[in-house]
């Protein structure tokens, strides 16, 4: 699983790319996205 901490500290990524990765993870893990 990719943690929020890892994603937010992944330099050079656009905000949408972070949302994209969160959402792909959400579709698999069914974590709440709010």
């Amino acid at each position: 699983a990719v943690s929020e901490h890892q994603l937010l500290h992944d330099k050079g990524k656009s905000i949408q790319d972070l949302r994209r990765r969160f959402f792909l993870h959400h579709l698999i893990a069914e974590i709440h996205t709010a």
Partner: antibody, heavy 118, light 115 residues
């Protein structure tokens, strides 16, 4: 290998309903989000619906919201698309697609043709 | 509004290099997109995702002749040493989540002809 096989397409009158199925094999179906994407004859691609791995979350574009329902039966490794109040503009080949951790539509089925005509 | 714009057609010679363009709406210029290939009478196939910095990840079975790059709001798919089997429609796509709603849009597609 990943295999997705759609079925249930055919000719249907405007205003009627149809249910499409997508039989999945070659991977753990219950571990991935799934989607439907359609393509009208001679036209481009249009996203239709997405469902999370366990079926708890569903997403639709405005063009089909309230008319189409995506669902899944993980015990049968099958994805569904219930299409109600069909319109001529819903005529298309409907593809099911599987996500990966990296992208939304990584694997595609061969498609099933839905024709809405009186 | 999230919009992707593609040229409707492009022609290149066998063995040449082809560069296809997908342009994001200006306010979405940093977005990651996806490229898909659809050969005649076949379903679409995932080619790659392409980020704003030009980094990309290719799909299963995609030859290394396929590469991606970015400049501003433009996303490019480059196919080197064109083969006859590269003749296909190429679509770009982009997804986003807004207020817990998901949206995904495709460009209109580019028909690539290999001469």
């Amino acid at each position: 290998q990943v295999q997705l096989v759609e079925s249930g397409g055919g000719v249907v009158q405007p205003g009627r309903s149809l249910r499409l199925s997508c039989a999945a094999s070659g991977f753990t179906f219950s571990s991935y989000g799934m989607s439907w994407v359609r393509q009208a004859p001679g036209k481009g691609l249009e996203w239709v619906a997405t469902i999370s791995s366990g079926g708890s979350y569903t997403y639709y574009p405005d063009s089909v919201k309230g008319r189409f329902t995506i669902s899944r039966d993980n015990s049968k490794n099958t994805l569904y698309l219930q299409m109600n109040s069909l319109r001529a503009e819903d005529t298309a080949v409907y593809y099911c697609a599987r996500q990966t951790t990296m992208t939304y539509f990584a694997y595609w089925g061969q498609g099933t043709l839905v024709t809405v005509s009186s | 509004q999230l919009v992707l714009t593609q040229s409707s057609s492009a022609s290149f010679s066998l063995g040449a290099s082809a560069k296809l363009t997908c342009t994001l709406s200006s306010q979405h210029s940093t977005y990651t997109i996806e490229w898909y290939q659809q050969q005649p009478l076949k379903p679409p196939k995932y080619v790659m995702d392409l980020k704003q910095d030009g980094s990309h990840s290719t799909g299963d079975g995609i030859p290394d002749r396929f590469s991606g790059s970015s400049s501003g709001a433009e996303r490019y798919l480059t196919i080197s040493s064109l083969q006859s089997e590269d003749e296909a429609d190429y679509y770009c796509g982009v997804g986003d989540t807004i207020k817990e709603q998901f949206v995904y849009v495709f460009g209109g597609g580019t028909k690539l002809t290999v001469l």
